[in-house]
Interface confidence: low
């Protein structure tokens, strides 16, 4: 079987005009996923990005995410890729709100 | 069954480009990206760059001024250019899939092919 | 860049032996992003292990791997001969993404 994870992009302040954006991927499986930050449709260096485990959800499904730090102001430049089971999207960083995308099955 | 088969010229002048075409069989370029490698003669590894599934491309920074990958998912191909080579270039080129989750590890391998440059 | 340092560069063992072999990173890795390949003469690498220790399918359980930070090993608990080769680490840590210049594991 295979659920295609829900993406969920959310931005958190920090100090000195930085913020922090987190892509979560969530309710998926098979457990195999690559989460990745691109700023201008390049994928960053995994040194400026952060990574969750894949941990079990409790549904039979997984969940994990991604973090990079971005200057604020900057968010339209950023996005979140994810590839899943031969699914793959391009998720952009929420203006204001949070932003829910499901991938295609 | 999986399979990656590296094809093009074996010998190319200096200051020329080398032209490679993987072509894969068993899987589709678009549910899986791809890598060139290569390796110069009784050396070891050399990451050259990728393609993502969604056409993307990440490059060695050591090449990036002169190297270009892309895919034709219709013919399931993906190929690279590599401008003005020198005898430096010379080595075995290996095309290879990105494996799922596998975090960019190269799962499948071409056999690999010999590109010599010299005049 | 991240420099993977292997050692030792040739490990001279018999059939039946323990070998352990060393991949020391220049700068801290994340062990999601290192992995090990094995290379015969005249053939291609193959994927061995993923993210430091996740053995590929089909690949004997004589192998394993550990550890973390900068020093990462390959282990084969009993040497067949179809094992004797060379191996190399990887990192996907940072661009750009190096091999170790590997370590030749031979015949005594």
């Known amino acids: 079987r295979t659920v295609p994870p829900m993406v969920n992009v959310t931005c958190s302040e920090v100090s000195e005009g930085n913020i922090t954006v987190t892509c979560r991927a969530s309710s998926f499986y098979p457990r195999n996923i690559t989460l990745t930050w691109r700023q201008d449709g390049v994928s960053l260096s995994h040194n400026t990005q952060q990574w969750g485990d894949v941990l079990p959800d409790g549904n039979g499904t997984y969940q994990t995410w991604v973090a990079t730090r971005i200057r604020q102001g900057e968010e339209q430049r950023f996005t979140c890729y994810m590839e899943h089971s031969g699914n793959h999207g391009t998720h952009p960083v929420p203006s204001g709100k949070v932003l829910v995308l499901q991938s295609q099955r | 069954q999986v399979q990656l088969q590296e094809s093009g010229p074996g010998l190319v002048k200096p200051s020329e480009t080398l032209s490679l075409t993987c072509t894969v069989s068993?899987?589709?370029?678009?549910?899986?990206?791809g890598h060139w490698i290569r390796q110069p003669p009784g050396k070891g590894l050399e990451w050259i760059g990728m393609?993502?599934?969604?056409?993307?491309?990440d490059y060695n920074a050591a090449f990036i001024s002169r190297v270009t990958i892309s895919v034709d998912t219709s013919k399931n191909q993906f190929s690279l250019k590599l401008s003005s080579v020198t005898a430096a270039d010379t080595a075995v080129y290996y095309c290879?899939?990105?494996?799922?989750?596998?975090?960019?590890?190269?799962?499948?391998w071409g056999q690999g092919t010999l590109v010599t440059v010299s005049s | 860049e991240i420099v993977l340092t292997q050692s030792p560069g040739t490990l001279s063992l018999s059939p039946g032996e323990r070998a352990t072999l060393s991949c020391t990173a220049s700068s801290s890795v994340s062990s999601s992003y290192l992995h090990w390949y094995q290379q015969k003469p005249g053939q291609a690498p193959r994927l061995l292990i993923y993210s430091t220790s996740n053995l590929i399918s089909g690949i004997p359980d004589r192998f394993s791997g550990s550890g973390s930070g900068t020093d990462f090993t390959l282990t084969i608990s009993r040497l067949e001969p179809e094992d004797f080769a060379v191996y190399y680490c990887h990192q996907y840590h940072r661009s750009p993404f190096t091999f170790g210049q590997g370590t030749k594991l031979e015949i005594k």
């Open positions: 290879a899939r990105k494996g799922h989750g596998y975090y960019y590890a190269m799962d499948y």
């Open positions: 393609i993502w599934t969604d056409g993307w491309t």
């Open positions: 068993g899987f589709s370029l678009t549910t899986y990206g």
